[in-house]
């Protein structure tokens, strides 16, 4: 499945509404890092069948989706940027989707790969949990929010690397 | 391959200004901070200040706050550390450093070559 | 601003040493702690982050601990080209500082 040119335009352009989300000074919020054991060994070059990355990929920016769609996240972020992050996000999902259909069916994809999709959930989880522990201060969401850039830019090396095996 | 390449030694006078460079290749620039750090000859490391390159944020050590200029250029990957006005007391090794952010990884995991200053009359 | 102090600050050692260097911070930083080692003339090196983690490439003989105000950077058998000076410096918060070095020597 070749996924459309718009695709990697999106991603930047998600990258760049993140880096426009930002409230306060990170330099302040330091003292505030924290180890969310980002899932690395499922975004590397191990042998990854294609309709597997893109299941994860979904499953990334489907969490990435959410957690930015919470009531907590509207209260703590730009309104504005957040509606453009949505819009983005929607479409990678869309073209993702499409490419999980063609790559392996419907009916298999979802429990395929559940080991994959579980380990990008539970990292998620780990991140929510970091948000609520912290009362979704101004610092934990700037810790959130340079967490996510890193996946996110995780996310878009291995799509490049799908692309370069096609 | 990470890279951050300083520029060259600089013989200077008192009074005189300088701007020296670390230019960062292997990596994408913007994701990272950097930091400057000094060494004075026989003595131990002083940070100096840090600069996101993203947006040109800035923070310096309070003995380094006004001292000194940090900024960037992101569209060349160079990170610049500034004086206006010299003193013999610069006389140093100047090292570049990367930084992660508030990301959790290495801290000053690659550095420049340094930068030797040596001001003089 | 968060005080560094290392201990000792040289000390002499022969191969094969098992080599500890102390670092206390003047409040508590977690864990947040790296060590460096610099040889005359060179970048310093990071060898230790996050009190613990041993960077990429760092031989296993390098060992961090500690957490809250009191650290340890142990080698655990010395190597000739261990000899060096060894820096640690907190990541807590800015300022960040350094400690003022503990320079290893051969006996």
């Known amino acids: 499945c070749d996924l459309p040119q718009t695709h990697s335009l999106g991603n930047r352009r998600a990258l760049i509404l993140l880096a426009q989300m930002r409230r306060i000074s990170p330099f302040s919020c330091l003292k505030d890092r924290h180890d969310f054991e980002f899932p690395q060994e499922e975004f590397d070059d191990k042998q990854f069948q294609k309709a597997q990355a893109i299941s994860v990929l979904h499953e990334m920016i489907q969490q990435t989706f959410n957690l930015f769609s919470t009531k907590d996240s509207s209260a703590a972020l730009d309104e504005t940027l957040l509606d453009e992050f949505y819009i983005e996000l929607d479409q990678q999902l869309n073209d993702l989707e499409s490419c999980v259909m063609q790559e392996v069916g419907v009916i298999e994809s979802p429990l395929m790969y559940e080991d994959s999709i579980l380990a990008v959930r539970k990292y998620f989880q780990r991140i929510t949990l970091y948000l609520t522990e912290k009362k979704y201060s101004s610092c934990a969401w700037e810790v959130v929010r340079a967490e996510i850039m890193r996946s996110f830019s995780l996310s878009i090396n291995l799509q490049k690397r799908l692309k370069s095996k096609e | 391959e990470v890279q951050l390449v300083q520029s060259g030694a600089e013989v200077k006078k008192p009074g005189e200004s300088l701007k020296i460079s670390c230019k960062g290749s292997?990596?994408?620039?913007?994701?990272?901070?950097i930091g400057w750090v000094r060494q004075m000859p026989g003595k131990g490391l002083e940070w100096m200040g840090i600069?996101?390159?993203?947006?040109?944020?800035?923070a310096y050590s309070p003995s380094f706050q006004g001292q000194v200029t940090i900024s960037a250029d992101k569209s060349i990957s160079t990170a610049y550390l500034q004086w206006s006005s010299l003193k013999a007391s610069d006389t140093a090794m100047y090292y570049c450093?990367?930084?992660?952010?508030?990301?959790?990884?290495?801290?000053?995991?690659?550095w420049g070559q340094g930068t030797l200053v040596t001001v003089s009359s | 601003d968060i005080q560094m102090t290392q201990s000792p600050s040289s000390l002499s050692a022969s191969v094969g040493d098992r080599v500890t260097i102390t670092c206390r911070a003047s409040?508590?930083?977690?864990?947040?702690l790296n060590w460096y080692q610099q040889k005359p003339g060179k970048a310093p090196k990071l060898l230790i982050y996050?009190?613990?983690s041993l960077q990429s490439g760092v031989p296993s003989r390098f060992s961090g601990s500690g957490s809250g105000t009191d650290f340890t950077l142990t080698i655990s058998s010395l190597q000739p080209e261990d000899f060096a000076t060894y820096y640690c410096?907190?990541?807590?918060?800015?300022?960040?500082?350094f400690g003022q070095g503990t320079k290893v020597e051969i006996k």
């Open positions: 410096q907190q990541s807590y918060d800015f300022p960040l500082t």
């Open positions: 450093a990367r930084h992660p952010g508030l990301n959790w990884a290495p801290d000053f995991d690659y």
């Open positions: 292997g990596y994408s620039f913007t994701s990272y901070w």
């Open positions: 409040q508590s930083i977690d864990g947040s």
């Open positions: 600069i996101d390159p993203s947006d040109s944020d800035t």
């Open positions: 996050f009190a613990s």
